[in-house]
Interface confidence: low
């Protein structure tokens, strides 16, 4: 950066070389320049020449003044006018950033997800600070008093093999920046009840025919947690409202779930599924699409967007398609 | 490591069935989906479904239903693609793919070396 | 399906340049893309997933960005055994779907 420069004097800060956004601040050039007593001093603020607010102090130093500095980042140099020099010479140069202190990291969450090995922690860090803020993720075993830090600069992955102290832990976040420090609540964790299952996944949808059609939704996980309570919803695409199924679901196979669904109507479903009685869910799977059949005994196959017509069959609608992915399930 | 290691190349008259077998070693076979994904001469990748290795689902893109199907051998940590009455148009390296990242989807993340299935003449 | 719009379909660059490669999603893949390498001898290889989470062992050299609905993947600065065909792979719907691919060629 502009700090690596080789400096004929020196550039300093006040308050100091981070500080909060909106202060006023002060920036000091005093040139050191051999054979030079400077006629004017400049300032330059990422490479553009600063024309106001300049007050000559000495013979060799200046002060820039800024009211309500608001910028995150900005390079700062100064340079001198010599006597029988041509150009301009530099003199020093300082990278300076504005920014917030941390606020207070709350919604702190940790949970297991299914084969990853890992302890996953979040929180939500409050307002966006600006400057460089780093996290210490503090893990104490109840049961030990063993505890454990991690730094990180947003979330963190704590392998489960290093969880050796129980069952039993406080989990608790330190913000620290340049500007201050702050500290979560903590939050007590037990690792058998933060487990996530891994991902349900909606594969196909198929209408039959009968006396009243009836649609049937083919849904899977790789799931080795044997009790396993899911929630599938489903709503027309034109609707906002959605209608919500629960299930107690036993993976060990393709799990079968049976709608009856107007006719000539595109639906979308999605499923999220946790551990039965536990407290965190997985997000809602990716949106599935199926548009029932025409109740006339026309018969359509339908598999990723793609029609073809078939004569005789029960089998009214097929549907093999997910069209987006968004975890959040934000749709209609 | 983990590894996905696909049997050899083959060379089939049209008619004929050829089975790939893809072994898999490094991990535990039944948590991750195992992806199939075909490769033309000359051509790009293209995905031909995935099979659920912990209950052996099958899913298949619309471009493979019928003719082609996915097994599994779990207690020997293998999944096996088989082509029936194979076709000209069936020439192409074909390649297992170890799914990943629930439950979020990262996709694939490791891949076998491939298999080439050549039609003679 | 979502159509992944890969370009250039080919490339020359000299060793130590930096290249970009792009795909567009037809539809809305919320980042779910990875980008894949594959070499000479047929091998293939992950190098980002979730349009910009490095592999572990996957040179620095490499970084994928998103900005809307296109997706970049970067080589700061070429090295020999970079040149190869690369891939983008779309998983947030089925089917799953593949750029067409970029050959990468030394020039």
């Known amino acids: 950066g502009i700090t690596n420069i080789n400096c004929s004097g020196h550039i300093w800060v006040e308050p100091a070389t981070i500080f909060k956004m909106g202060m006023n601040i002060s920036i000091y050039c005093q040139a050191a320049i051999k054979n030079c007593q400077p006629r004017k001093l400049h300032f330059y603020k990422n490479g553009i020449k600063e024309r106001f607010q300049i007050t000559r102090i000495n013979k060799t130093t200046a002060r820039l003044w800024y009211k309500n500095f608001l910028e995150p980042h900005a390079s700062m140099y100064c340079t001198a006018e010599c006597p029988k020099h041509f150009q301009e010479t530099l003199i020093c140069g300082k990278d300076i950033s504005s920014g917030y202190p941390p606020d207070i990291p709350d919604e702190v969450t940790c949970v297991i997800y299914e084969y990853s090995g890992n302890m996953t922690c979040t929180w939500n860090a409050g307002k966006l600070t600006y400057i460089d803020t780093k996290y210490v993720v503090h893990v104490k075993s109840l049961e030990t008093e063993e505890e454990q830090q991690y730094l990180t600069s947003s979330y963190i992955n704590i392998s489960t093999d290093s969880l050796q102290g129980g069952k039993k832990y406080l989990v608790w976040v330190q913000a620290a920046n340049a500007l201050g420090m702050e500290e979560s609540k903590q939050l007590q964790i037990h690792l058998d009840d933060i487990v996530i299952p891994s991902a349900a996944v909606i594969s196909r949808a198929e209408t039959i025919n009968a006396t009243v059609p009836k649609t049937i939704i083919y849904w899977d996980s790789q799931t080795t947690i044997e009790k396993v309570s899911c929630e599938m919803r489903y709503k027309a695409t034109t609707n906002q409202t959605w209608n919500v199924k629960e299930f107690d679901t036993n993976f060990t196979y393709v799990q079968q779930s049976e709608f009856y669904l107007e006719p000539n109507i595109k639906y979308v479903f999605q499923v999220r599924c946790q551990e039965t009685g536990k407290r965190y869910w997985q997000p809602w799977s990716s949106l599935f699409f199926h548009k029932t059949p025409e109740t006339v005994p026309q018969v359509t196959s339908k598999a990723f967007q793609h029609d073809t017509w078939n004569s005789g069959l029960t089998v009214a609608s097929i549907s093999t398609g997910h069209l987006t992915s968004d975890n959040r399930g934000d749709i209609g | 490591q983990i590894q996905l290691v696909q049997s050899g190349p083959e060379l089939k008259k049209p008619g004929e069935t050829v089975k790939i077998s893809c072994k898999a070693s490094g991990y535990t076979f039944t948590n991750y989906g195992m992806n199939w994904v075909k490769q033309a001469p000359g051509k790009g990748l293209k995905w031909m479904g995935w099979?659920?290795?912990?209950?052996?689902?099958?899913t298949y893109a619309d471009d493979f239903k019928g003719r082609f199907a996915f097994s599994l051998e779990t207690s020997a940590s293998t999944a096996y693609l088989q082509i029936n009455n194979f076709k000209n148009e069936d020439t192409a390296t074909y390649f297992c793919a170890r799914g990943n990242g629930y439950p979020y989807y990262y996709g694939i993340n490791y891949w076998g070396q491939g298999t080439s299935v050549t039609v003679s003449s | 399906d979502v159509q992944m719009i890969q370009s250039p379909s080919s490339l020359s660059a000299s060793l130590g340049e930096r290249v970009s490669l792009t795909c567009r999603a037809s539809?809305?893949?919320?980042?779910?893309l990875s980008w894949l390498q594959q070499k000479p001898d047929g091998t293939i290889k992950r190098l980002i997933y979730?349009?910009?989470t490095l592999d572990s062992g996957v040179p620095k050299r490499f970084s994928g960005s998103r900005s809307g609905s296109d997706y970049s993947l970067t080589i700061s600065s070429l090295e020999s055994e970079d040149f190869a065909d690369y891939y983008c792979?779309?998983?947030?719907?089925?089917?799953?779907?593949f750029g067409a691919g970029t050959r990468l060629e030394i020039k």
């Open positions: 979730a349009a910009s």
């Open positions: 792979l779309q998983y947030a719907s089925y089917p799953w779907t």
């Open positions: 099979i659920n290795t912990y209950t052996g689902a099958p």
């Open positions: 539809q809305e893949i919320s980042g779910n």
